[in-house]
């Protein structure tokens, strides 16, 4: 065949593409009633020509429906708003085990859509604590377990510790562990772990604080070393002699127990008796000498001195001046100038 | 020097009983708490029952609640592990390990569970 | 249970070698999580607690780290007695393991 030229016409133009079914821009959230202020619920969807919201699977009256409409900026689609209120009566009206509940449904040419369910609870949070910390007494770097179980709440309550007022946070102090079902550990008390402890559970409604457990962590005495040895009572013979030690390895803290068993101890000692040293008998003159004198000597030997006994006090020698036997006095003069030293010399010690 | 000993542990038919000690030194175990992990032929470590004394505070892993039973004779200072109904999953190797921190170990004891 | 999902299952390094080995918890678990290191036939050793907390004892090559529920053990060089089995545990909930790295010689 021979090319016309012309263009073939389609058999049908392409219509304007059909309208979607509803998006929601906007579901209903989970919300709590606190006290007797009514929560708002609100919807928002496009393209959507209605918005009705359906509580407990009934329709809710056309009056309760707040709407606004306007054109989305991006898309220029018609969006639909709608909030409905749903006060703590209503609520309470609705008997049956199932909480009360809420969901928007939108319409556009192309059908239906639902949006998610909302569930609307009335807030609260019992006085009274299912469990609350015990004040304990532990030894230094021993383990503390503190347990809480918060009131029963709606929503459910969150916890947190106080000690001495301050929240704990255990990733600034590693030393303390929080756990799922909030009990609070010590690792390793330590000294400035000894404080007022409080579970503190706080929802929307309120907060709550538990009684104060006060944790002591205390420290046991400890024996120092023992001292030496007293010196034995008695210088001589039999006596006693004593040594200590004191409850101040650690001392006891914060109520720790003090030291078991004796602060000092005594044992008898015998110590031997010192012996002082006594002078022998002099013994006899010796002759007289050339230079005129004689001499005579002792020694301390009767007793010698023992066991750290005193020596003997005096001379071991004795010298006089003598005229006889050797002695050649007739050679010196009376003007002698050196004559007076053998009288002195009486009383001179040699040794 | 801290030291834990288990010991208890051994071969016992299905739905049998069986109960594991662990024997502390070194430390009172009334201010620690106990746990008891197990650890299977080849396998992962599972974290089975924990004891507090001095809070009466226990705890069990879903596995092992209302057949297993943690305690504490702190007189002894010692922790017990009692196992009834015992399946053969629950064989394993036993550890006890102290404090939370599971800071100290035991050495471990089997557990077989086979007819 | 909060479930700890431990990467990689087993490792191949040299000495000398950086290694990390992650965690990741399915929820928060705060910073209550523990590293031990076990060898076989023998019991698990603790090694960083509170995420980063190095036990006393344990040489410094080792450290720990926490970003949101991720957690990562870090051994800076690997020496030759670090071949062994690697365990993080969360006790923020009922105890809960990782399923373990195995750290093998390349």
């Known amino acids: 065949g021979t090319d016309s030229g012309s263009e073939v016409l389609p058999d049908s133009f392409p219509s304007a593409p059909a309208e979607p079914l509803p998006y929601f821009l906007q579901e209903p959230q989970d919300a709590y009633i606190v006290k007797n202020k009514p929560v708002e619920l609100r919807c928002r969807a496009f393209p959507a020509t209605q918005i009705y919201f359906k509580c407990n699977g009934e329709w809710v009256s056309q009056n309760d429906h707040v709407t606004q409409e306007g054109l989305d900026e991006a898309t220029g689609l018609r969006v639909r708003e709608v909030q409905i209120e749903v006060s703590r009566q209503q609520v309470e009206e609705l008997f049956g085990l199932e909480d009360y509940w809420c969901q928007c449904v939108a319409w556009s040419s192309a059908g239906t859509t639902k949006s998610r369910r909302a569930y609307v609870r009335i807030a609260y949070l019992r006085k009274n604590f299912d469990q609350e910390p015990l004040g304990k007494e532990v030894p230094l770097d021993h383990e503390v377990l503190l347990q809480c179980r918060p009131p029963e709440g709606v929503p459910v309550a969150e916890v947190e510790w106080l000690k001495n007022e301050d929240v704990i946070d255990p990733t600034q102090d590693t030393n303390f562990l929080l756990t799922i079902d909030h009990n609070l550990i010590i690792r390793q008390a330590r000294l400035s772990d000894t404080a007022n402890y409080t579970c503190v559970a706080k929802n929307i409604v309120a907060k709550r604080r538990s009684t104060t457990a006060t944790v002591i962590v205390y420290v046991n005495g400890g024996w120092s070393s023992w001292a030496e040895w007293s010196p034995c009572s008695n210088r001589c013979g039999r006596g006693w002699q004593k040594r200590t030690r004191t409850c101040t390895n650690p001392a006891p803290l914060n109520g720790g127990a003090f030291c078991e068993g004796q602060a000092f101890q005594k044992t008898a000692c015998t110590t031997i008796c010192p012996v002082d040293g006594a002078w022998t008998e002099w013994s006899k003159w010796s002759a007289c000498s050339t230079e005129c004198a004689h001499w005579r000597s002792r020694e301390c030997m009767a007793p010698p001195p023992q066991n750290g006994g005193r020596d003997c006090s005096g001379t071991l020698l004795d010298s006089k001046n003598c005229t006889d036997g050797l002695c050649m006095q007739n050679k010196k003069t009376l003007s002698d100038p050196n004559s007076h030293l053998l009288e002195a010399s009486g009383d001179a010690a040699l040794y | 020097e801290v030291q834990l000993v288990e010991s208890g542990g051994g071969l016992v038919q299905p739905g049998g009983s069986l109960r594991l000690s662990c024997a502390a030194s070194g430390f009172n175990l009334y201010y620690y708490s106990m746990h008891w992990v197990r650890q299977a032929p080849g396998k992962g470590l599972e974290w089975v029952a924990s004891i507090y004394s001095y809070s009466s505070y226990t705890s069990y892993a879903d596995s092992v609640k209302g057949r297993f039973t943690i305690s504490a004779d702190t007189s002894k200072n010692t922790a017990y592990l009692q196992m009834n109904s015992l399946r053969a999953e629950d064989t394993a190797v036993y550890y006890c390990?102290?404090?939370?921190?599971?800071?100290?170990w035991g050495q471990g004891t089997l557990v077989t569970v086979s007819s | 249970d909060i479930q700890m999902t431990q990467s990689p299952s087993s490792l191949s390094a040299s000495v000398g070698d950086r290694v990390t080995i992650t965690c990741r918890a399915s929820?928060?678990?705060?910073?209550?999580v523990a590293w031990y290191q076990q060898k076989p036939g023998k019991a698990p050793k603790l090694l960083i607690y509170s995420a980063s907390s190095l036990y006393s004892g344990v040489p410094s090559r080792f450290s720990g780290s926490r970003s949101g529920t991720d957690f990562t053990l870090t051994i800076s060089s690997l020496q030759p007695e670090d071949f062994a089995t690697y365990y993080c545990?969360?006790?923020?909930?009922?105890?809960?393991f990782g399923q373990g790295t195995k750290v093998e010689i390349k």
């Open positions: 390990a102290r404090s939370y921190a599971m800071d100290y």
């Open positions: 929820q928060s678990v705060s910073s209550a």
């Open positions: 545990q969360q006790s923020y909930g009922p105890f809960t």
